[in-house]
């Protein structure tokens, strides 16, 4: 699996997750957000030869068929396919509120 | 939606579904298919700015963080969203053999 | 320029809802709280509540007893004001207001043009 | 919750006077250093305009003529050289406790 584990422990050219740490005021613009001040996001990055985690069957007939045409604009992408919550907290007025949002933390990626 | 409704009669730049036609002798060196000689496949391009059709939080967080950050190389990417099957007729020695093959047609994009 | 634009006023019977629409431009939308808050003919200003568009985040004045409901279309940057079970106290302009940026509950920098709702049988 | 309470409910001031509007708390709304304290103007017909952000900040575009000042409960907004354009109903609110509230206005 193209995880942080094995992504982060390599130097891997191809699609893997790379590192990637988000400033919530600095990056987003966010200043509300109390804990954290940024975090860990992660992000997808490297190309999609053919047969390299393949997403659908799709994605294998676009890989091949950039091997048989290697200058086509058609090709698969490395996106996120785990993806983890992150818990924040905020204030609302004086009061704290702490909120689990989804999707927030790349754990691993795929060609699709 | 980022579908063939809307991006074949457009022309829109930025991710969106694309005309592309696979030829399975030429462009994939599947000899043994027989009918059909190809078809149209489809692919996904374009650029994923913010608010573009965006598939998860993390997706949202990551243009954001493009857009205050222009040179950084995390951003979304455009990948196929909603995925067609096609029938295909192949010969098992005389024997003609119909088969559905999932996730091959391209209907629309999305930024991930 | 970052303009805040409602829809039309609305003329509806008790018991009915109302959802009110703020369509937002010149701003990143998923950047910015959004506040929704009413005006009762001759009367001052009551905030309802407000939403965090980029995950739908929403804290609410508990006056308004669970009637108000707010929701956020970021693929469109338009925010929603849901309002149900309505009586004639209900009758009020309802302003969208852009939260200032710093904290969650904050002073309001940009304003909608008002959408008068109208209860009557 | 927070009751805010201005004072004068409505004013007339010449033009070129000072006018002053105050607003009490019904407890202190500050917190961590600021005085989460902001005032509005609401011109007849119109949407209200942010004027003085956390007590005593000038909201950029606004006016100078405009200036606030106070802490804890206490709060003072200030329009020197009184215009006919400033006519309006004026409003103080606070956010340092939920839920959000408002002065009642002062015309």
């Known amino acids: 699996a193209l995880d942080t584990n094995y992504c982060f422990s390599s130097t891997e050219k191809n699609c893997c997750v790379r590192q990637l740490y988000i400033d919530f005021r600095k990056d987003l613009g966010w200043k509300w957000i109390h804990e954290p001040k940024g975090y860990h996001a992660n992000f997808c990055l490297g190309p999609c030869p053919y047969i390299w985690s393949l997403d659908t069957q799709y994605s294998k007939v676009l890989a091949l068929y950039n091997q048989h045409n290697p200058g086509a604009s058609a090709a698969p992408c490395c996106v996120p396919q785990a993806l983890e919550p992150l818990p924040i907290v905020y204030y609302v007025g004086r009061k704290p509120k702490v909120e689990q949002l989804s999707n927030m933390i790349v754990r691993s990626c795929k060609c699709s | 939606a980022l579908d063939t409704n809307y991006c074949f009669s457009s022309t829109e730049k930025n991710c969106c579904v694309r005309q592309l036609y696979i030829d399975f002798r030429k462009d994939l060196g599947w000899k043994w298919i027989h009918e059909p000689k190809g078809y149209h496949a489809n692919f996904c391009l374009g650029p994923c700015p913010y608010i573009w059709s965006l598939d998860t939080q993390y997706s949202k967080v990551l243009a954001l963080y493009n857009q205050h950050n222009p040179g950084a190389s995390a951003a979304p990417c455009c990948v196929p969203q909603a995925l067609e099957p096609l029938p295909i007729v192949y010969y098992v020695g005389r024997k003609p053999k119909v088969e559905q093959l999932s996730n091959m047609i391209v209907r629309s994009c999305k930024c991930s | 320029e970052v303009q805040l634009v409602q829809s039309g006023a609305e003329v509806k019977k008790p018991g009915a809802s109302v959802k009110v629409s703020c369509k937002t431009s010149?701003?990143?939308?998923?950047?910015?709280?959004m506040n929704w808050v009413r005006q009762a003919p001759g009367a001052g200003l009551d905030w309802m509540g407000q939403i965090f568009p980029a995950w739908g985040s929403t804290n609410y004045n508990e006056m308004f007893e669970g009637r108000v409901t707010l929701t956020a279309d970021t693929s469109t940057s338009t925010a929603y004001m849901e309002l149900s079970s309505l009586r004639a106290g209900d009758i009020a302009v309802y302003y969208c207001a852009r939260g200032y940026g710093n904290y969650a509950l904050d002073a309001m920098d940009y304003w909608g043009q008002g959408t008068l709702v109208t209860v009557s049988s | 919750d927070i009751v805010m309470t201005q004072t004068p409910p409505s004013l007339s001031v010449s033009p070129r006077e000072t006018a002053s509007i105050s607003c009490r708390a019904s407890e202190s709304v500050d917190s961590y250093g600021n005085s989460f304290m902001h005032w509005y103007l609401q011109k007849p017909g119109q949407s209200p305009q942010l004027l003085i952000y956390l007590a005593s900040n000038l909201e950029s575009g606004v006016s100078d003529r405009f200036s606030g000042s106070g802490s804890g409960t206490d709060f003072t907004l200030r329009i020197s050289r009184v215009e006919a354009n400033d006519t309006g109903v004026y409003y103080c609110q606070q956010n340092d406790e939920d839920p959000l509230s408002f002065g009642q206005g002062t015309k």
């Open positions: 010149g701003y990143t939308f998923i950047k910015y709280w």
